[in-house]
Structure formats: C-alpha cells, structure tokens
Interface confidence: low
C-alpha cells in the first residue's frame, strides 16, 4: 500500500517558499484557530437516542496529547419510554484527524504525521437485515 | 495537552521553549485509507437523524477534501418513516487538525490548523423551556 504524501500539489512553487530537505516538510505547530470551541447542543451525548460516553486518551509522545473518544452506551437505541429498543442500532460516527508523533533517538527528536480515527459520537440507524435463503 | 521533555543529559538549547517549527517526515503514517464517508458506510441514509454530505475542497489544505454533514430535518424519522418534530436532529461536531500551506502554494511548508467539522447527526430529546 502506498503511503500518501502531503507535499504533492498542482501549484507552481513560488520563489518565496522556504528551503526544505528532501523527504521532509516544514511544519509550524503554532495552531491557527487554537481557541476555537465546539458549539454543540448541550450534553447531546446523554440526550441522544443513541447515547455515548467519552474517554480521554493521553499520550505525551503525540500532539495533541489528549484525544477524546466516544463509545456508544447501548447496542440498541433508546425509545420514547426510555427503554432500549434492540430493533434499532446505536452505531459510532467516526472522523479522521491528523496528529504529530514525536520519536526520541538518544538526544535527537524526529516527527511524523499520523492520521488517527476518532469516534465522535453515535447515531441511531435501522439495521440492515440479511435474509438467509 | 501534555508534552514529553528532552532527555536528561541532552545539551540544553538556548531557548527553553519547544521549537515552534519542526521538520516532519513527508510520509503520513496512516492506517485509515478510506476518507470518503459515502463509501465507508451508509449511516447517513439509515439514521433516524439522516444527513447529507457536502464536499468541502481547498487545495491550500491537507486533506484537501473534507466532507461536511448537514442534518436533513429538524425532527427525527419515526418508525413509520415520517418526521417526528417532538425530537430533534442535531449535528455532531468535532475539532480536527489539518495542514494549511504556509506560505500559500508552497508544496512542503505547512502550519497546523484546527477546524470544526460536522461529522454526522444524532437524534435527541429537545430541551423544553417552560415560559412562566
């Protein structure tokens, strides 16, 4: 499997581009929109018909070091009576994001970009029923 | 967030701050090759809070294509296939990190950018405000 490269682009390279060693790219880790905040409806993870819990994973060799993952609480969905209905399914919704991984070799440090899959929340779906002949 | 400090015994740099700019290997370590949510699952159609996926393309960003979810209804789909307005379809949002070409158009120079994306929708019981 080919590992995707970030550097490829159809643009003509401007003269002002900084020099970069082969096989590398220059990455400024000062984040644009650092203080942007998620403005989701209040505690939707508890009010959803497919509720979920959050867990924080912590890895100091990764940036960002905290990644929040959601886990669906039920296999089924919560009906109007507040009971689990297993004729419906709670399923995870996932999104890819980039992280920077830091590797230590003695006194030198190298950096690698990594795509990670984050489970963001859950949704209630009608199950796919396979009829056996 | 948390960071790992340097090895004890390594020479101290002039600047105690972590460098703002780092050189990163061009290859992205990537276990998840399928980035098209339309191909990865049909939850957006089967959900009781279905959504449409809109393609957001920006060649100055990596990844250049991001799919944005928009809930199809204010309410949720009930067992009869009708929209029930006693429930609400709401977007699930997530902050993700992407790379922004900086300076613009440069092939191998980037800055991290945090963006907010709507990933899908979920059906919730509404918060009812009683007016006195």
């Amino acid at each position: 499997r080919k590992i995707p490269k970030v550097g490829h682009t159809f643009f003509q390279k401007p003269e002002s581009c900084p020099p970069v060693p082969g096989g590398s790219m220059k990455l400024d880790i000062g984040i644009i929109n650092e203080n942007q905040r998620v403005s989701m409806s209040r505690n939707i993870e508890s009010r959803s018909t497919s509720p979920w819990n959050y867990t924080v994973t912590w890895d100091p060799n990764r940036y960002p070091s905290e990644v929040v993952q959601a886990q669906c609480r039920n296999l089924g969905c919560i009906n109007a009576q507040g009971k689990e209905d297993i004729s419906m399914n709670s399923v995870p919704i996932q999104q890819e994001t980039l992280v920077v991984r830091r590797k230590h070799q003695g006194c030198s440090v190298s950096f690698q970009l990594e795509k990670v899959l984050v489970t963001v929340g859950c949704t209630c779906v009608t199950p796919v029923i396979h009829h056996v002949q | 967030g948390i960071t790992i400090p340097r090895n004890p015994g390594c020479p101290n740099s002039e600047d105690k701050n972590f460098p703002r700019t780092v050189m990163v290997n061009l290859n992205i370590h990537n276990r998840n090759t399928n980035t098209n949510p339309k191909r990865s699952s049909d939850y957006y159609n089967r959900s009781t809070s279905p959504w449409n996926l809109h393609r957001n393309e920006d060649p100055e960003r990596y990844p250049s294509v991001i799919w944005e979810a928009k809930c199809r209804h204010l309410g949720c789909i009930n067992a009869d296939g009708n929209v029930d307005y006693h429930m609400n379809s709401v977007p699930i949002q997530q902050e993700i990190l992407v790379l922004r070409r900086e300076p613009p158009h440069c092939p191998n120079s980037f800055r991290l950018e945090k963006i907010l994306v709507s990933v899908g929708c979920t059906c919730v019981t509404p918060i009812v405000h009683h007016v006195a």
Epitope: I29, P64 | I2, T3, R6, K16, N17
Partner: nanobody, 117 residues
C-alpha cells in the same frame, strides 16, 4: 534556578508498592503542570502521569491506570507518585518533569525503580 529532585525509588517485589517524591524548587507548582515519565532500557520514553493543577485534571498512561496515583502538595512544593500492584514491566528510570504542552521542559535526574522477585 529551577530544580526537580526525585526520590523514593528502589527494589520491590511484584505486587508491592512504592511512593516516589519530586521536590521542586525555583518555581511554584501551581504554575506548571508536573508529571512523571519513565524510560526502560531500549524502550521509548513513556508518559506515566501528569497533574495539571491549572485545569484541575490528572492524566495517566494506559499501562498504569488504576494502579498509580499522582498527587501534589503545594505547601511542600512536592509531587508524589503512589505506585501500587507493581509489575516487572514497571521497571524503569522514573523522571519528574514539567509536562505543559510544547513549553518548558525541566527534568529531574531520575530515580531507578526495579520490580523483581
């Protein structure tokens, strides 16, 4: 001058406990997040725990969750790591360090923890 001095390491049997201390001088603990890291021979350095007093949260690496507890005594300017149910794979040099995101990186000299029967 900023200094972090660890103590409390030693040899312990599997299932046993140890309490590591990290005495900080030259700055107030309330200002920095202070944590514990460990490095076993030939292994990647690993984050054990971090006490982020600014937001009141503590973090633990997956391998130590439920067994190790970090605490801070601001009056003594000391951070502790209570290690219970120790396993041979916990054998490493344990370092106390600031663990704020991409900022200051002050280290102690480390204390050896050996878990063996």
């Amino acid at each position: 001058e900023v200094q972090l001095v660890e103590s409390g390491g030693g040899l312990v049997q599997p299932g046993g406990s140890l309490r590591l201390s990290c005495a900080a001088s030259g700055f107030a603990l309330g200002y920095y997040a202070i944590g514990w890291f460990r490095q076993a021979p030939g292994k990647e350095r690993e984050g054990v725990s971090c006490d982020s007093s600014s937001d009141g949260r503590t973090y633990y690496g997956d391998s130590v969750k439920g067994r190790f507890t970090i605490s801070t005594d601001s009056a003594k300017n000391t951070v502790y790591l209570q290690m219970n149910s120790l396993k041979p794979e916990d054998t490493a040099v344990y370092y106390c360090a600031t663990c704020t995101d991409f900022e200051y990186d002050y280290w102690g000299q480390g204390t050896q923890v050996t878990v063996s029967s």
